[in-house]
């Protein structure tokens, strides 16, 4: 059964720009990926990007770029004002949902804390399943 991993990386030279990387470990067909966050723009869940393998990508601010890194992983780059970024990132959770066949939906989320440099390797984060 596939597991989803999430990694958040801040640009060392630009504190207002960072990227969310997520992927799936274990083989399954990926129908689509949704990347979202909570506590970043407002109190609710904000959809940042939806990526379809065959049909392209939709993205919404503050996402600046969303793309497939490999057939099993995606990357979303976000940009926002530096002061806003510093003040809000401590309370932000990023979630990636992979809709797969035949395993259903797989979701992993990662809280971004000021002291958390992000995962250095794709290890599973909190995994929620909805078959």
């Amino acid at each position: 059964s596939p597991e989803v991993w999430v990694q958040v990386q801040m640009e060392a030279t630009n504190l207002s720009s960072f990227s969310v990387h997520c992927g799936v470990l274990g083989y399954s067909l990926i129908s689509l990926v949704t990347v979202s966050c909570e506590g970043f723009v407002d109190a609710g869940r904000t959809k940042l990007a939806v990526l379809h393998p065959e049909f392209g990508t939709q993205q919404w601010a503050p996402a600046r770029q969303a793309h497939w890194e490999t057939p099993n992983s995606v990357s979303v780059t976000l940009t926002m004002g530096q002061s806003k970024a510093r003040s809000s990132l401590a309370n932000t959770t990023f979630c990636c949902e992979f809709v797969t066949f035949p395993h259903g939906s797989r979701v992993a989320c990662r809280d971004l804390h000021r002291s958390d440099p992000g995962l250095s390797a794709p290890t599973p984060a909190l995994n929620l399943q909805a078959d």
Partner: antibody
Framework: QVQLQQSGAELAKPGSSVMISCKAS????????VHWIKQTTGQALEWTGY????????KYNEKFKGKATLTVDKSSTTAYMQLSSLTPVDTAVYYC?????????WGQGTLVTVSS | DIVLTQSPALAVSLGQRATISCRAS??????????MQWYQQKPGQEPKILIY???NLPSGIPARFSGSGSGTDFTLTIDPVQADDIATYYC?????????FGSGTKLEIK
């Protein structure tokens, strides 16, 4: 542009096997699964199974296990389906299609006729 | 297996709206997504995808095609119907194993 070019029509005898091919071009072959779909004269479409060219992973519709065998040759970006122990009910057009769980691109189809 | 039921045929006049339905034996929705596709097959040709995830149009598909629905009930709408739309239309679910198709609806002109 994406193209899936299938091999020509086959006339086979009951009990024999056939191998049909699907040559992919215009995209990264290992990024998408190649599915095979059967269409009988009565127009019904049935998913046979898929192979993931990157990993070689296969998944079959239970109904076609033992009937179909899927393989790929990455070097020639070609997918193959072998149909074995043929009977008249295997007479159909067989399509290859690329995509994930949606069939975004289709080959032109290969007619397999099983007759003694 | 998820069984997709379509009516066999639909006759409409050119310039009118055609509504083709597909009913699933169980829900094909997962999370917030409706995992249903529609394909068009003209006589002697391979199928071609028209709609994915119930309501999304791939690039190059005319805007007169639209899709809607959730759960078990889905609709493909062609408005207005043109002579070039004469074909058989199939729904396909991508939620459960095995992937399955509807039996097809043949669009005819009155």
């Amino acid at each position: 542009q994406v193209q899936l070019q299938q091999s020509g029509a086959e006339l086979a005898k009951p009990g024999s096997s056939v191998m049909i091919s699907c040559k992919a071009s215009g995209y990264t072959f290992t990024n998408y699964a190649v599915h095979w779909i059967k269409q009988t004269t009565g127009q019904a479409l049935e998913w046979t199974g898929y192979i993931a060219p990157g990993s070689g992973v296969t998944k079959y519709n239970e109904k076609f296990k033992g009937k179909a065998t899927l393989t790929v040759d990455k070097s020639s970006t070609t997918a193959y389906m072998q149909l074995s122990s043929l009977t008249p009910v295997d007479t159909a057009v067989y399509y290859c299609a690329s995509g994930t769980t949606r069939f975004a691109y289709w080959g032109q189809g290969t007619l397999v006729t099983v007759s003694s | 297996d998820i069984v997709l039921t379509q009516s066999p045929a639909l006759a409409v006049s050119l310039g009118q709206r055609a509504t083709i339905s597909c009913r699933a034996s169980q829900s094909v929705s997962l999370s917030s997504y409706n995992l249903m596709q529609w394909y068009q097959q003209k006589p002697g040709q391979e199928p071609k995808i028209l709609i994915y995830d119930a309501s999304n149009l791939p690039s190059g598909i005319p805007a007169r095609f639209s899709g809607s629905g959730s759960g078990t009930d889905f609709t493909l709408t062609i408005d207005p119907v043109q002579a070039d739309d004469i074909a058989t239309y199939y729904c396909q679910q991508s939620k459960d194993d095995p992937l399955t198709f509807g039996s097809g609806t043949k669009l005819e002109i009155k």
